[in-house]
Amino acid sequence: LPKAPVITTPLETVDALVEEVATFMCAVESYPQPEISWTRNKILIKLFDTRYSIRENGQLLTILSVEDSDDGIYCCTANNGVGGAVESCGALQVKMKPKITRPPINVKIIEGLKAVLPCTTMGNPKPSVSWIKGDSPLRENSRIAVLESGSLRIHNVQKEDAGQYRCVAKNSLGTAYSKVVKLEVEVFARILRAPESHNVTFGSFVTLHCTATGIPVPTITWIENGNAVSSGSIQESVKDRVIDSRLQLFITKPGLYTCIATNKHGEKFSTAKAAATISIAEWSKPQKDNKGYCAQYRGEVCNAVLAKDALVFLNTSYADPEEAQELLVHTAWNELKVVSPVCRPAAEALLCNHIFQECSPGVVPTPIPICREYCLAVKELFCAKEWLVMEEKTHRGLYRSEMHLLSVPECSKLPSMHWDPTACARLPHLDYNKENLKTFPPMTSSKPSVDIPNLPSSSSSSFSVSPTYSMT
């Protein structure tokens, strides 16, 4: 006999995990067999929708791979034309393991500002979010809070907040961890120890000391009367984010010296400054004691060696400085007539630059000595044998003139170019032609293999000799 449809197994609420299978069962008794249709949120599910499988004459609805958007009310309706259609409804609750949809990223922040590390999550039940710093759970306090969104907010960021962070999302189905991110706290440059002012005698050495800190570690520059320091040696050391800079000065004039500590924060810089004054006791005294003056070289002996129109230091301890220094060079050059062709041009360059030192004009004209390394090269590479003889004669007082003692500089007492490239003078390039190289210095016993370029012989104004046998 015909029988109206009756749903014998009403639909129940189904819990399903994302990407898993979910099945609703709608068992119907009727005669004839009913047509069963399914809806989700009152919208008909089409039979040919490939995300679903409908079996057992429509009594089983299977969602093949649950998505988080599949949650809602599912209803089955049975109708066979006998009596009215019947309906049963049930809910699909999509359960989801925690997922971090917006993970935290590395952050660089300046001390004192507010930092926010994002951590947006998904999941059902809604995940709770906590944070780990280093290896330990992060404790919230008046400055540090986990927001409703899961993000971490840090007010008034401190140096100790720097470190590695990760967020943890947790619900009954599982736990998700973000990747580890770094919070770097940058600190404006700050001077810890300012240079001290000094009142010193003319010609004394003074060391100015400046210590600064910051993150990143600042660089220290020194300014002399508004310009970059042009003389003096700077020694720096860095320890535990503190930079220590010492400027050693040879005082020939008063000045204002400023230590500037600078560090960079992204595209911006922060600077801190501290200044010290150097005053000279009886500042007028150096004028009386001034040992010389600057003038263009007008002699003959060193014409080929010194640069054209070179400004040289003339020593006023001689009655006639130009005449005396020229005689000094002349005497020394006569001694050089007997030295080897390898040594002679180098020695001539050294002597001329030593006796007629380059001059730095100013309130107090200052002679610029030859750089130690150039002196050593002449002494040890070009003129090893001759130098020993010269030193021996000097010590035994065999030179005719006392003035000749000045003609051999003591290399070890000269300033190094590494200390301050502007505080000493380089010798002109020394360069030989192949034919000049008959002998090698005594420094090495084995004859080295050499590429000697063809070079023009030296011309009038700039003297140019150097041992092609010596690279270093």
Partner: antibody, heavy 124, light 107 residues
Amino acid sequence: EVQLVESGGGLVQPGGSLRLSCAASGFTVSSSSIHWVRQAPGKGLEWVASISSSYGSTSYADSVKGRFTISADTSKNTAYLQMNSLRAEDTAVYYCARSEGDRYVSGYFGFDYWGQGTLVTVSS
Amino acid sequence: DIQMTQSPSSLSASVGDRVTITCRASQSVSSAVAWYQQKPGKAPKLLIYSASSLYSGVPSRFSGSRSGTDFTLTISSLQPEDFATYYCQQSGVWLITFGQGTKVEIK
């Protein structure tokens, strides 16, 4: 800021060739001497070659003479080491370094700046 | 060729110790001798040049000296950051040679 950056290292078969580059910044190659120094795995430092490009003067260690060529392109501020007929014993990290001044005086300054090194592996 | 014989090849020392490393040249050399410090995986760093001059930025506990063909590097009071390998280097006429290195280890 003075910087030296080496490149061109890699794996090469015995008998093969490689060209190492040393790009300089913060100073001019023409006013300095440039040197190549190598260090085999677990071993000490070995000087390879030097150039004073203001004169184009070069020198080489006996172990590489005739196989390696050092050169410099002052317009690119770069030094090069062309390595031919490579052998297994050439396997090393190759550093370029600079020293102040021209060739006859540079030794007194020491090698004050070095690159990070580039690894050359010679193996079949 | 000039050989630079460095000794000892390794040494163990404690923080605060005075450490001396020597390089002997096989024949007369110039004072173009330098000392370097190298840490694993890093390029060498210049400490001393011209046999006895301290390079800029290097702590004053490092010093170099010369006696004939013997060159010495001294660390007056060893610090934790000084544990490394040290090399001497002589720059002769067209020939540059390094010592074989001295590894300074923590005792």
